[in-house]
Interface confidence: medium
């Protein structure tokens, strides 16, 4: 359905509040260094223009595409060249190349200060003084740090942020009410950002076929009672939504997401019995709820898969007639029977099945050739099962911090060329899989763990793509989306790596260490651990443990001293010398 004015269409569909919020997110995700006031000004100008188009769709420029309108507006920023350098060259291009150029310049690791949370009274005063500005600032600060954050979901986070302040700034103990809510929003927000980043990477690096395969598997697990045709329709619509959001088309994305939520709620009977409680909620909450909905119960009478996909003499005929549909049906049937498998495992099985059919359907006796195809799945299934079992045992034995350290050592030995901050960030997040997944019942462990690891490893891939330093990382990241995790798991100690020269400065600490939060102290220690491994990649676990224990004791001693700085100055060199001796 075509509209004379796309901007008027979206303004009317979304309403002013969501329209303004989404435009602010879009601009903040593109121009991540621009000051807040500049973005607010641009958003207000776009909004006023949209209102003129709503009043008269034939008015001047109202027929232009959203990319043209938004790109023109972004290109009016006076400091574009000096702030963004070559990104300013995008403005010399025509659409659609200009938008593609802006997308390519999105920075996953922008040089922005960490968001420091001031005292609760500061935040409550700012909230009461100007609620609208306060919430816009939240959208801006999150969007510029997370340039692929799922925009309609960010509006939902902002609504929760607003609700938290509205409730807690009235409370007797504001901090006790507010801080846990803000911690929860921060942690959920980071997780949401990382999950969306994987969806965008999947679409952008591996194409919509890869994303659709992921969606078929995941939706079939969630909605095992739905027919294949119903799942296919949802997959097509969901792919459109995420393609739009990942492409910076945030108004279209939010609009289509709302349409998808409406469709699902109108067709609950043919999708899932679990949708009912979501469908009674307001739009943003409803869409979030539908995205997070638990798996429906599997139908009791599902027949064996072997009949249609192994025993049937028509397998090659059906495959040849419509390869993607046949493989899609296989994936749907397998996934709806296996909520206990990770999506990535299901996709590996579908890939293995496809490879077998490609080979066997060209053979003299195809049926004889593919008769044992399901037996070939066994090692593929056992590999993640064993991995989860071993790592959960290690997590339970060590606890989260020491489990993270074990992963830090493991990954630094695999890819020592990767920057220390990236290794620390990624390994800390890999280590969080323990607390997140190991407490779950057996049937939920693998999907939780492996699909979470895929999200974390995608962060490594995204950061590494910006500054590539390791052929191994490039290989694991680019060869196969579904085999990324097994590829990283299979990496061994990099024998070709030349150990980093010892730098005493790296292991020099000061009294400011004592005022750090527990998390910041851990990061400092883990940074030192990575540097140690880079210096001595063949150090044993025992050697590294000895050094880290000495480090903890040294820091504890100096933080208890009367003259902390003097203690660090005196004890530091002793610690460095002892560490070098222990690792010699």
């Amino acid at each position: 359905d075509t509209h004379k004015s796309e901007v008027a269409h979206r303004f009317k569909d979304l309403g002013e509040e969501h329209f303004k919020g989404l435009v602010l997110v879009a601009f903040s995700q593109y121009l991540q260094q621009c000051p807040f006031e500049e973005h607010v000004k641009l958003v207000n100008e776009v909004t006023e223009f949209a209102k003129t188009c709503v009043a008269d769709e034939s008015a001047e420029n109202c027929d232009k595409s959203l990319h043209t309108l938004f790109g023109d507006k972004l290109c009016t920023v006076a400091t574009l060249r000096e702030t963004y350098g070559e990104m300013a060259d995008c403005c010399a291009k025509q659409e659609p190349e200009r938008n593609e150029c802006f997308l390519q310049h999105k920075d996953d690791n922008p040089n922005l200060p960490p968001l420091v949370r001031p005292e609760v009274d500061v935040m409550c005063t700012a909230f009461h003084d100007n609620e609208a500005t306060f919430l816009k600032k939240y959208l801006y600060e999150v969007a510029r740090r997370h340039p692929y954050f799922y925009a309609p979901e960010l509006l939902f986070f902002a609504a929760r942020y607003k609700a938290a302040f509205a409730e807690c700034c009235q409370a007797a103990d504001k901090a006790a009410c507010l801080l846990p809510k803000l911690d929860e929003l921060r942690d959920e927000g980071k997780a949401s950002s990382a999950k969306q980043r994987l969806k965008c990477a999947s679409l952008q690096k591996f194409g919509d076929r890869a994303f659709k395969a992921w969606a078929v598997a995941r939706l079939s697990q969630k909605f095992p009672k739905a027919e294949f045709a119903e799942v296919s329709k949802l997959v097509t619509d969901l792919t459109k939504v995420h393609t739009e959001c990942c492409h910076g088309d945030l108004l279209e994305c939010a609009d289509d997401r709302a349409d998808l939520a409406k469709y699902m709620c109108e067709n609950q009977d043919s999708i899932s019995s679990k949708l009912k409680e979501c469908c009674d909620k307001p739009l943003l909450e409803k869409s979030h709820c539908l995205a997070e909905v638990e798996n429906d119960e599997m139908p009791a009478d599902l027949p064996s898969l072997a009949a249609d996909y192994v025993e049937s003499k028509d397998v090659c005929k059906n495959y040849a007639e419509a390869k993607d549909v046949f493989l899609g049906m296989f994936l749907y049937e397998y996934a709806r029977r296996h909520p206990d498998y990770s999506v990535m495992l299901l996709l590996r099985l579908a890939k293995a099945y496809e490879a077998t059919l490609e080979k066997c359907c060209a053979a003299a006796d195809p049926h004889e050739c593919y008769a044992k195809v399901f037996d070939e799945f066994q090692p593929l299934v056992e590999e993640p099962q064993n991995l989860v079992k071993q790592n959960c045992e290690l997590f339970e034995q060590l606890g989260e911090y020491k489990f993270q350290n074990a992963l830090l050592v493991r990954y630094t030995k695999k890819v020592p060329q990767v920057s220390t901050p990236t290794l620390v960030e990624v390994s800390r997040n890999l280590g969080k899989v323990g607390a997140k997944c190991c407490k779950l019942p057996e049937a939920k462990r693998m999907p939780c763990a492996e699909d979470y690891l895929s999200v974390v490893l995608n962060r490594l891939c995204v950061l590494h793509e910006k500054t590539p330093v390791s052929e191994k990382v490039t290989k694991c990241c680019t060869e196969s989306l579904v085999n990324r995790r097994p590829c990283f798991s299979a990496l061994e100690l990099d024998e070709a790596y030349v150990p980093k020269a010892f730098n005493a400065e790296t292991f020099t600490f000061h009294a400011d260490m004592c005022t750090l939060s527990e998390k910041e102290k851990q990061v400092k220690k883990q940074t030192a651990l990575v540097e140690l491994v880079k210096h001595k990649p063949k150090a044993t676990k025992e050697q590294l443990k000895g050094v880290m224990d000495n480090f903890a004791a040294f820091v504890e001693k100096c933080c208890k001293a009367d003259d902390k700085e003097a203690c660090f100055a005196e004890e530091g060199p002793k610690f460095v010398a002892a560490s070098q001796a222990a690792l010699a």
């Epitope: 200060p113 968001l115 420091v116 001031p118 500061v122």
Partner: nanobody, 115 residues
């Protein structure tokens, strides 16, 4: 409305000193930061002081500028020594520390350094 009032700016020769003050209406806020905006440039962080008194400075002012505060007077200061021509800008303060501002900007105070 919280109001932030900056003062202490002026014209000075290279190598000179100024002390800027910023008063926050109502109460003492933490953390606080000084920012500046030169003509045709974006506003940038200059110095910040945390809840615990820890400080942070832009590389270009390290060793020359000192941020401090007087909790009793709800005031934060920026002592600027060895001023250079590139320090010429309008200086603003805000609540929120390094790179983050929580309240509407005040009018700022102009600092001009030239011979």
């Amino acid at each position: 409305q919280v109001q932030l009032v900056e003062s202490g700016g002026g014209s000075v020769q290279p190598g000179g000193s100024l002390r800027l003050s910023c008063a926050a209406s109502g109460r003492n806020f933490n953390p606080m930061g000084w920012f500046r905006q030169a003509p045709g440039k974006q506003r940038e962080s200059v110095a910040a002081i945390g809840t615990d008194g820890s400080t942070k400075y832009a590389d270009s002012v390290k060793g020359r500028f000192t941020i401090s505060r007087d909790n009793g007077k709800n005031t934060v200061y920026l002592q600027m020594n060895s001023l250079k021509s590139e320090d010429t800008a309008v200086y603003y303060c805000n609540v929120g520390g390094w790179g983050i501002s929580w309240f509407p900007w005040g009018r700022g105070t102009q600092v001009s350094v030239s011979s």
